[in-house]
Amino acid sequence: GCDRNCGLITGAVIGAVLAVFGGILMPVGDMLIQKTIKKEVVLEEGTIAFKNWVKTGTEIYRQFWIFDVQNPQEVMMNSSNIQVKQRGPYTYRVRFLAKENITQDPKDNTVSFLQPNGAIFEPSLSVGTEADNFTVLNLAVAAASHIYPNPFVQVVLNSLINKSKSSMFQVRTLRELLWGYTDPFLSLVPYPVSTRVGMFYPYNNTADGVYKVFNGKDSISKVAIIDTYKGKRNLSYWESYCDMINGTDAASFPPFVEKSQVLQFFSSDICRSIYAVFESDVNLKGIPVYRFVLPSKAFASPVQNPDNHCFCTEKIISKNCTSYGVLDISKCKEGKPVYISLPHFLYASPDVSETIDGLNPNEEEHRTYLDIEPITGFTLQFAKRLQVNLLVKPSNKIQVLKRLKRNYIVPILWLNETGTIGDEKAKMFRSQVTGKINLLGLIEMILLSVGVVMFVAFMISYCACRSKTIK
């Protein structure tokens, strides 16, 4: 009798020990995970995060769709709606260069760097060549007439526009439109002005920054968050809190991301900080990620979202701040009338697109999203979509703009910048992060469940034996 009872008690004790061990392993394991993650996401030499941060291991592509104007004469002569036809994608590989001038500052636990710009055309991922021609708005004419509303100067500009045989629209190659060309009208200005014009001019051999971000050594909750941009904590483009540089650069976020979080990030492309909210759980190459999206609320007018009041900088084009879905970034573009929106004016008010025919906004194709691995905070997949537009206004002094009867926010192009973790990197991530966490979770669950089952089973057996013996 004793042998059997002792065996049952021993089994129950072993079960209890296993269950307790499994239970203890939960917080202890979480602590170990947190400790490892905290160590590895710090932006300093030797960590996994630092290696991937210096030079992204992911191939990033920027696809362009150009809005080819189908009726230039009709618009110029009759102020008709602009008929556009998008052509693309024309794909470039971007962000392949390592960060430069990386400098750690141990005093305030920050690291500063420059992000060099470079673009390599990918013919195999494009519908045509860089020599393809497009009819687009004349960038210099639209910009000059906006920068110089002065009637006297507009007469001077008109003389130069006419002499150079420039018009409201122009035919340019993809390479010229994106990366720059010498403008014939600006070439006639008898002062030293930049005569090169392009949607992304200058780009190659330039760099974005200097960025100064927290390296996370003192507080992991601050890792990758921007401290200063170009030496300042503010942009000087907007009023009040709209001018603040918030969050990270969206390549990563502080670890242990919660679904309830609002992820703030700064994008120099749009000259502002913006935010993303959780949308859904996604499985990316076997890695569970959270999909965060830019909500329509971020593009709303101050009438719909009072928080956006400081992004409304003028009253006329915005119809007294009631228009939505477009952002006037002229202050950030040396006064050029550049407006940023989502592609095809997704989430924009009808008045914005009423002068343009041929647009088909579509949430799936045209919204921006970030797929974030919640434990590390790394962005493993993203699609940044934006449209660049130029404002053109009537001018009674400039012949080629004289017959316009209304303002146009003219779409020039839209882009889709995407990056997805590669298969090899995903495999490595699964084995090093997801795999280990899953294994630890599995061990915890096995220990706990086996322990509990053993304890309960042996205790029941023991009790049953005891009651038999008593009888």
């Epitope: 509303p149 002065n150 009637p151 006297f152 100067v153 007469v155 001077v156 008109n158 003389s159 130069l160 006419n162 002499k163 006639l188 200005v189 008898p190 002062y191």
Partner: antibody, heavy 117, light 107 residues
Framework: EVQLVESGGGLVQPGGSLRLSCAAS????????IHWVRQAPGKGLEWVAW????????YYADSVKGRFTISADTSKNTAYLQMNSLRAEDTAVYYC??????????WGQGTLVTVSS | DIQMTQSPSSLSASVGDRVTITCRAS??????VAWYQQKPGKAPKLLIS???SLYSGVPSRFSGSGSGTDFTLTISSLQPEDFATYYC?????????FGQGTKVEIK
């Protein structure tokens, strides 16, 4: 070095005509456009006429419209002011001046036009 | 036409004085205002354009301010060579118009 030199001023009877010249050097007049500004004795400055760059539009003060004509000969890099039906109130020192954005960065030394019988 | 009203029409000052001349436009001209200095028998000389931008070679004691309709030319410390007549001019709209001038004389 940028220089503007006016000539052609003198004494003329009311109703008469005179042609002023403005010879430019150191820059191309067609790129900038040329203005004529006058100053009656002991009075302030009065803008008279302007020829826009590259032979663009011509503009005149109301007081001279229909009587004065501005022109330019790009081959000679010279601007002209043809003044017809002259009146006593046209008596002034006439300056030619260079401008692109509407302010005058270079001026000639001036030429005196006297309208008197 | 845009009228430019200058005040005062004349002023007396001593070397080293701070001198302020004002100019008012009859309508908004943004920052499209220039200031000139003219000495007897000479052509005017550009001092300031775009209301505040000092022309090259002009001493830094000259400064301009203002926007919209009200503009000011300031000479921080008057020098003997600064005794002259000063004109403002709007370069916003044709016809280009000048103020009637301010004569700065020795006290």
């Amino acid at each position: 070095e940028v220089q503007l030199v006016e000539s052609g001023g003198g004494l003329v009877q009311p109703g008469g005509s005179l042609r002023l010249s403005c010879a430019a050097s150191g820059f191309t007049i067609s790129s900038f456009g040329i203005h004529w500004v006058r100053q009656a004795p002991g009075k302030g400055l009065e803008w008279v006429a302007w020829i826009a760059p590259y032979g663009g539009d011509e503009y005149y003060a109301d007081s001279v419209k229909g009587r004065f004509t501005i022109s330019a000969d790009t081959s000679k890099n010279t601007a002209y002011l043809q003044m017809n039906s002259l009146r006593a109130e046209d008596t002034a020192v006439y300056y030619c001046a260079r401008s692109f954005f509407g302010y005058f960065d270079y001026w000639g030394q001036g030429t005196l036009v006297t309208v008197s019988s | 036409d845009i009228q430019m009203t200058q005040s005062p029409s004349s002023l007396s000052a001593s070397v080293g004085d701070r001198v302020t001349i004002t100019c008012r436009a009859s309508q908004d001209v943004s920052n499209w205002v220039a200031w000139y200095q003219q000495k007897p028998g000479k052509a005017p000389k550009l001092l300031i354009s775009y209301a505040t931008s000092l022309y090259s070679g002009v001493p830094s004691r000259f400064s301009g301010s203002g926007s919209g309709t009200d503009f000011t030319l300031t000479i921080s410390s008057l020098q003997p060579e600064d005794f002259a007549t000063y004109y403002c001019q709007q370069h916003s709209n044709a016809p280009l118009t000048f103020g009637q001038g301010t004569k700065v004389e020795i006290k």
